[in-house]
């Protein structure tokens, strides 16, 4: 677990969990609904999702200088996606199969965010938009878009943790 004052997280644990997240995100992606996506959702239907960008300090130099900037950004993203996967978009109709990886994905997002959250202090969490109820007919497209952007997010996070485990672990 990361600790206050800018200490390093458990890079190896984070690496393992982020790799698991990558696998789950890819396995969940095709399993989000009962039918093919339709043209009814061509417009942008997801809120602005978090992206890891150049200024977030997730490059090798930024991680060496102060990994906390990058880790905070990853933490914000994990919380954001955890909220989305816990919402009616995924628990409402069309029902996911009982053995859908989405449940595991949700739990793993929570697990990694807890691993990153420093004991005794809380990073400012990016304001999570209050999700208005999604109409059932919108959900297939929303799931598709959320999981697609989550795949990209966890892929970057996994690279960060792989780098940290290889070069920054004590």
């Amino acid at each position: 677990r990361a600790v206050p004052g800018g200490s390093s997280p458990a890079w190896t644990q984070c690496q393992q969990l982020s790799q698991k997240l990558c696998t789950l995100a890819w396995s969940a992606h095709p399993l989000v609904g009962h039918m093919d996506l339709r043209e009814e959702g061509d417009e942008e239907t997801t809120n602005d999702v978090p992206h890891i960008q150049c200024g977030d300090g997730c490059d090798p130099q930024g991680l060496r200088d102060n990994s906390q900037f990058c880790l905070q950004r990853i933490h914000q993203g994990l919380i954001f996606y955890e909220k989305l996967l816990g919402s009616d978009i995924f628990t409402g109709e069309p029902s996911l199969l009982p053995d859908s990886p989405v449940g595991q994905l949700h739990a793993s997002l929570l697990g990694l965010s807890q691993l990153l959250q420093p004991e005794g202090h809380h990073w400012e969490t990016q304001q999570i938009p209050s999700l208005s109820p999604s109409q059932p007919w919108q959900r297939l497209l929303l799931r598709f878009k959320i999981l697609r952007s989550l795949q990209a997010f966890v892929a970057v996070a996994a690279r960060v943790f792989a780098h940290g485990a290889a070069t920054l672990s004590p």
Partner: antibody
Framework: QVQLQQSGAELARPGASVKLSCKAS????????LKWVKQRTGQGLEWIGE????????HYNEKFKGKATLTADKSSSTAYMDLRSLTSEDSAVYFC????????WGQGTTITVSS | DIVLTQSPATLSVTPGDRVSLSCRAS??????LHWFQQRSHESPRLLIK???QSISGIPSRFSGSGSGSDFTLSINSVEPEDVGVYYC?????????FGSGTKLEIK
């Protein structure tokens, strides 16, 4: 197997409140929504609202806002519906159900409002 | 709100008959329509989901068709235990609504 076990019949006075329960078993309670449906004697089905236990989010039929309040206790896998300011119009059978496309319904709870 | 109109209100049939129950939506709901059967003093039972998808444990004589705003539930050889009220339900958008029901009787 999936089961939704509802609380027993209740007789209530006009103006009173009642709390109905629906205990889920046989599936992961937080994976699906839990809905409530009203059926008056000899009448059709009316959706009251639903709760998503994972997030706690609720959606209500406008007609039942102020009448029904839905809650869920994840630790006991139980959903609740509070009905307040009861009148004779609230006398009905109330069903709980999971997502429509799963087809799991409770056995119903009969509420009789009478002075 | 989406209004579902079912017809006929009552259907009186002989065992072995093939019957069709109609459900019309006030606007297009794609295939987000479910069919339920309710026998006297019982909970509703899901027969067909998403207009035409069959449900495990439901006899194969029940089938559904339609998309958009016109839907049909067919029972290809009615049995005495099929008596009850059949409801179609809008699963497309809030508020969820049910048709007023078709009562199936056996002559």
């Amino acid at each position: 197997q999936v089961q939704l076990q509802q609380s027993g019949a209740e007789l209530a006075r006009p103006g009173a409140s009642v709390k109905l329960s629906c205990k889920a078993s046989g599936y992961t309670f937080t994976s699906y929504s839990l809905k409530w449906v009203k059926q008056r004697t000899g009448q059709g089905l009316e959706w009251i609202g639903e709760i998503h236990p994972r997030s706690g989010n609720t959606h209500y039929n406008e007609k039942f806002k102020g009448k029904a309040t839905l809650t869920a206790d994840k630790s006991s896998s139980t959903a609740y519906m509070d009905l307040r300011s009861l009148t004779s119009e609230d006398s009905a059978v109330y069903f709980c159900a999971t997502n429509w496309d799963l087809g799991y319904w409770g056995q119903g709870t009969t509420i009789t409002v009478s002075s | 709100d989406i209004v579902l109109t079912q017809s006929p209100a009552t259907l009186s049939v002989t065992p072995g008959d093939r019957v069709s129950l109609s459900c019309r939506a006030s606007q297009s709901i794609s295939d987000y329509l479910h069919w339920f059967q309710q026998r006297s003093h019982e909970s509703p039972r899901l027969l067909i989901k998403y207009a035409s998808q069959s449900i495990s444990g439901i006899p194969s004589r029940f089938s559904g068709s339609g998309s958009g705003s016109d839907f049909t539930l067919s029972i290809n050889s009615v049995e005495p235990e099929d008596v009850g009220v059949y409801y179609c339900q809008n699963g497309h958008s809030f508020p969820f609504t049910f048709g007023s029901g078709t009562k199936l009787e056996i002559k």
